[in-house]
């Protein structure tokens, strides 16, 4: 029993407050913002992370508003409502009683309405396309090496089961990572593709959520892979419901 084991912190989520006051002195960690207990042996849900982020002291951060392709997270940061399991509630509202429906990754999937808006169920995002543009390099990366490195990253760093990384596409300088996970495929204990994608997105932006771990150092055969642009597309099991006005805008 060494001093290193007496470290009561959450390795998978630095946006927590931890104390060894659980049963038998177990280290218990609670997410900032929500105060909900989190399981530090796996990724914390995106909903709790967003809530923690909104509760943290605000620093001057410019939000990137991606171009409008299919379901892209155009709304940026908001303070979400999470259910007792830490998942997004299907209906989200702001302080001015404007409400909207979201999918399982918290991205708006309907027009905004008022408090009478109904969101019958939380629709699952079953397919995520992560579109990256890497900085210029001497030559293109070897596709199979790149594929192997990204699969290893999702397996080891984010603990996502390899079967959920459907494909890695590469046409220099664009890399696309496809994550697929149907409701029927996701077993108890499996990391959610939405959570893995969010951790990856924060890592790429140099805002790692892991406690005391170095930032993401992506290398393919020793060559640094530096990302200069990220776009994430979300496909839901049930198509989103937007008015024609938005679709033609």
């Amino acid at each position: 029993h060494t001093a290193a084991q007496d470290n009561c912190t959450c390795p998978t989520n630095k946006m927590t407050v931890c104390s060894p006051d659980g049963p038998g002195g177990r280290c218990q960690c609670r997410a900032l913002g929500s105060g909900m207990a989190v399981d530090c042996s796996t990724l914390t849900s995106k909903c709790l992370l967003l809530k923690a982020r909104m509760s943290a002291p605000k620093n001057a951060r410019t939000l990137v508003r991606p171009s409008e392709h299919a379901l892209v997270d155009n709304d940026g940061l908001y303070d979400p409502d999470c259910d007792p399991e830490g998942r997004f509630k299907a209906r989200q509202c702001n302080q001015t009683s404007v409400c909207w429906c979201v999918n399982s990754v918290g991205v708006r999937r309907t027009d905004k309405g008022d408090l009478s808006l109904r969101c019958d169920e939380l629709v699952r995002t079953h397919h995520i396309l992560i579109d990256l543009r890497h900085r210029p390099t001497a030559g293109a990366f070897n596709h199979s090496d790149l594929d192997a490195e990204l699969r290893r990253l999702f397996r080891e760093r984010y603990r996502l089961h390899p079967k959920f990384v459907a494909a890695v596409h590469y046409e220099q300088p664009t890399i696309q990572i496809e994550l697929r996970q149907n409701t029927s495929q996701k077993a108890a204990g499996d990391v959610d593709i939405g959570d893995a994608a969010y951790y990856f997105e924060r890592d790429i932006k140099g805002e790692s959520l892991f406690q005391g771990r170095g930032g993401l150092d992506l290398r393919v055969r020793g060559e640094p892979l530096q990302v200069e642009r990220t776009l994430i597309y979300y496909l839901d099991e049930i198509p989103p419901k937007f008015s024609m006005k938005r679709l033609t805008a």
Epitope: H1, Q5, D6, S19, P20, D21, G22, P23, G24, G25, R26, C27
Partner: antibody, heavy 116, light 107 residues
Framework: QVQLQQSGPELVKPGASVKMSCKAS????????INWVKQRPGQGLEWVGQ????????YYNEPFKGEATLTADKSSNTAYMQLSSLTSEDSAVYFC?????????WGQGTLVTVSA | DIKMTQSPSSMFASLGERVTITCKAS??????LSWFQQKPGKSPKTLIY???RLVDGVPSRFSGSGSGQDYSLTISSLDYEDMGVYYC?????????FGAGTKLELK
């Protein structure tokens, strides 16, 4: 090294109260929980409750709620357990133990004898 | 409350013998299990925590294993100083609960 020094034996009358102590040394008192465990003569171990001196948060085993009171004095690095309305069933050795992730350092125990 | 069923309640074994004591929880305790040794008139001593982590200074002949509801403590080669009472403890949830104990005696 971690040490937990418990107070000496107590002989008390039925209906009376007793307050025993557990003085901690060799570590930061407010960083770890102290648990209290009861052992009747020739019997097994029974968990009484837990206190976290860092926040004074407590948990009690249902049979001891209202009977046991756990406190901690940060200035003297000492945890206390008070037992009230004692009966012969409370005659036992009471151990304090510093726990972290299931790993425990134990005090030597305080023998409480309830007798008229 | 989680009930811990420990077996056997007592056993006789010879020096050098392999000894196994088991604990069954009434529900999954996620490896939150410790093993303690107690000798007459002494306080308990922690041997194993988190089901299989050996405490520094405890002889390597002691090992813990198991998952879910079923756990065991094994002494690979019994030594004279291993005589005493062994208890398991679950700390998955409050209240903490101990097994009834296993008294290990020399055959």
């Amino acid at each position: 090294q971690v040490q937990l020094q418990q107070s000496g034996p107590e002989l008390v009358k039925p209906g009376a109260s007793v307050k025993m102590s557990c003085k901690a040394s060799g570590y930061t008192f407010t960083d770890y929980v102290i648990n209290w465990v009861k052992q009747r003569p020739g019997q097994g171990l029974e968990w009484v409750g837990q206190i976290y001196p860092g926040s004074d948060g407590t948990y009690y085993n249902e049979p001891f709620k209202g009977e046991a009171t756990l406190t901690a004095d940060k200035s003297s690095n000492t945890a206390y357990m008070q037992l009230s309305s004692l009966t012969s069933e409370d005659s036992a050795v009471y151990f304090c133990a510093r726990f972290f992730e299931g790993f425990a350092y134990w005090g030597q125990g305080t023998l409480v004898t309830v007798s008229a | 409350d989680i009930k811990m069923t420990q077996s056997p309640s007592s056993m006789f074994a010879s020096l050098g013998e392999r000894v196994t004591i088991t604990c069954k929880a009434s529900q999954d305790i996620n490896w939150y299990l410790s093993w303690f040794q107690q000798k007459p008139g002494k306080s308990p001593k922690t041997l194993i925590y988190r089901a299989n982590r050996l405490v520094d200074g405890v002889p390597s002949r002691f090992s813990g294993s198991g998952s879910g509801q079923d756990y065991s403590l094994t002494i690979s080669s019994l030594d004279y100083e291993d005589m005493g009472v062994y208890y398991c403890l679950q700390y998955e949830e409050f209240p903490l609960t101990f097994g009834a104990g296993t008294k290990l005696e020399l055959k």
